[in-house]
């Protein structure tokens, strides 16, 4: 294939330096609804058809992506050279922003494997810039939440400071699929369901006297329940005493259920009470063991290399807390008899 014949698209990614955001490129021709053809000027015996349609991103399941270095180096395989870029079918996901993502990205269907193929490919020239103008203080976030069961909206971050009237025509995609009905800078959702969750992309065209390019932003949309009104509850330990063997290692697990909170800062820690003294124990990191729409179960263990006589006099306390309040559960060790 010859990249000189690829259809070319120019894209601009203006990222906010104060927030994490992602970006995507679709393996798509400028007008995906049209049927495009890859003409071949010589056929090998395997390739019988005279024309092969270049399908829109909805149909392409297996594509190859390349990066064209600016220094005249040959094309590179994105899989190996760029660990922060992930290929998912016909979409290229950029996990971290930065001007180093600027460059030319080429995609083509994998199924064409003849050296005689004339270009059946798309070349995307991506320019990445940090956001400079602070004129729009309340621009929409790249992570937006929709409250299940209520009315909500998804705003295009790069256009959220413009009124609907002055906003250019916007092209929206959800999880890589074109949302042909949506054309404004805001998608209004009459009633939010869990299927509204996903990766939304908004594109609009910007032009100057020389050229035009597509300004793109990516929004991660979560569907959420209302914030919990309850403090966390401890699921384990249930008993306040635990039979142990002296001299043996011991692990005590603390499992707690935290209700959903939009701003989630769970606390789960172990501390030890010994007569009048009380101190926090440095224990392994807490880990989430189950996460649902409504709540999350977090576990944190305390590990004793070997149980001593002194440990029998102590109380081991698990402390859990969210924005509503805290809960504790203490455990007293008891020597196993017999």
């Amino acid at each position: 294939f010859n990249i000189s014949g690829c259809s070319t698209k120019k894209l601009l990614w203006t990222y906010s330096t104060r927030s994490e955001e992602e970006f995507v490129l679709f393996c798509d021709l400028p007008e995906p609804q049209k049927s495009h053809f890859c003409h071949r000027n010589r056929l090998s015996p395997k390739q019988v058809p005279e024309h092969l349609p270049f399908m829109g991103s909805n149909d392409l399941s297996d594509v190859q992506w390349y990066q064209q270095p600016s220094n005249g180096d040959p094309l590179e395989d994105i899989r190996k050279s760029y660990p922060h870029i992930i290929q998912d079918k016909c979409t290229l996901h950029f996990l971290t922003p930065g001007v180093n993502n600027s460059g030319s990205y080429i995609c083509r269907p994998k199924m064409i494997k003849s050296p005689y193929d004339v270009a059946c490919c798309v070349k995307m020239i991506l320019e990445v810039k940090p956001q400079t103008n602070a004129s729009c203080e309340y621009s929409a976030s790249h992570k937006q939440d929709l409250l299940l069961g209520s009315t909500g909206s998804i705003s295009c971050p790069s256009l959220s400071c413009q009124s609907d009237a002055q906003s250019p025509a916007v092209t929206w995609y959800k999880n890589g699929k074109l949302l042909s009905v949506e054309r404004s800078n805001r998608i209004v959702v009459d009633e939010v369901y869990d299927y509204h969750q996903g990766t939304y992309v908004c594109d609009y065209t910007q032009s100057d006297t020389v050229s035009s390019w597509t300004v793109r932003a990516v929004v991660q949309v979560r569907t959420i329940v209302g914030d919990t009104k309850l403090k966390p509850d401890i699921l384990d330990p249930v008993e306040d005493t635990l039979e142990v063997e002296l001299g043996k290692p011991l692990t005590i697990s603390c499992k707690a259920r935290f209700g959903f909170e939009r701003v989630f800062n769970p606390v789960i820690k172990w501390y030890i009470k010994d007569s009048d003294l009380e101190w926090e124990v440095s224990v392994p990191e807490a880990k989430s063991i189950k996460s649902t729409l409504k709540d999350e179960i977090i576990e944190r263990n305390i590990i004793l290399e070997k149980v001593t006589q002194r440990d029998l006099r102590r109380k081991f306390v698990c402390f859990v807390q969210n924005s509503i309040g805290n809960t504790t559960q203490s455990v007293q060790l008891k020597e196993k008899r017999g």
């Epitope: 064209q68 220094n71 005249g72 180096d73 040959p74 050279s81 080429i106 050296p115």
Partner: antibody
């Protein structure tokens, strides 16, 4: 076509420069120009490649690094400089051309070979 | 470097028979593999590229398959003219599409 020159009978420890000359095409197109050798009765062994694009990127077999240098000396010639030659380097040295991915090719395979030039290392 | 391990070193089969040659790469080479045929005193001839694509003019009796690290060349309906040494070659290394390591070669003897 491709033609190699510079093969010779040399003593162990000597150096040698081999030249590959292209005709009928020039390096203005994007190619990988490579050197491959074949010892008598043995298999093909890749040595090094140079990209004919503006970057002139090079790629060497790990055993060849440090004792071989591939260079593009003009728009139609590529050289291979070899140092500290030993009897194990005795072989037919061939120049081969591979297309570059994205410039008419899907994978970089050899579609043009020279006849080779014989290098004999012996005391 | 990618290391290409080719098996067997030699194989013998009757006219009309089938031979299978395997090539294993030390890392995923994403189908960037070619197969060559070399007869004594001649230059190697490209048979298959991109793991499974037949070079123009090569009979369809030659079939390339495989993916990831495992690749196979199958020659069916063997002819006397197929007696030669066959080599696999990788053209992918660390994200670059560059010709590099060959397999050790397989000598095909046609009886």
């Amino acid at each position: 076509s491709l033609e190699e020159s510079g093969g010779d009978l040399v003593k162990p420890g000597a150096s040698l420069t081999l030249t590959c000359t292209a005709s009928g095409f020039s390096f203005v197109s994007m190619y990988w120009m490579c050197w491959v050798r074949q010892a008598p009765g043995k298999g093909l062994e890749w040595i090094a490649c140079i990209y004919t694009g503006s970057s002139g990127k090079t790629h060497y077999a790990s055993w060849a690094k440090g004792r071989s240098t591939i260079s593009k000396t003009s728009s139609t010639t590529v050289t291979l400089q070899m140092t500290s030659l030993t009897a194990a380097d005795t072989a037919l040295y061939s120049c081969a051309r591979a297309g570059s991915v994205g410039y008419g090719y899907d994978t970089a395979y050899f579609n043009l070979w020279g006849p080779g030039t014989l290098v004999t290392v012996s005391s | 470097d990618v290391v290409m391990t080719q098996t067997p070193a030699s194989v013998s089969a009757a006219v009309g028979g089938t031979v299978t040659i395997k090539c294993q790469a030390s890392q995923n080479i994403y189908d960037n593999l070619a197969w060559y045929q070399q007869k004594p005193g001649q230059r190697p001839k490209l048979l298959i590229y991109g793991a499974s694509n037949l070079e123009s003019g090569v009979p369809s009796r030659f079939k390339g398959s495989g993916s990831g690290t495992e690749y196979t060349l199958t020659i069916s309906d063997l002819e006397c003219a197929d007696a030669a040494t066959y080599y696999c070659q990788c053209s992918y290394d660390g994200g670059s599409y560059v010709p590099n390591a060959f397999g050790g070669g397989t000598e095909v003897v046609v009886q």
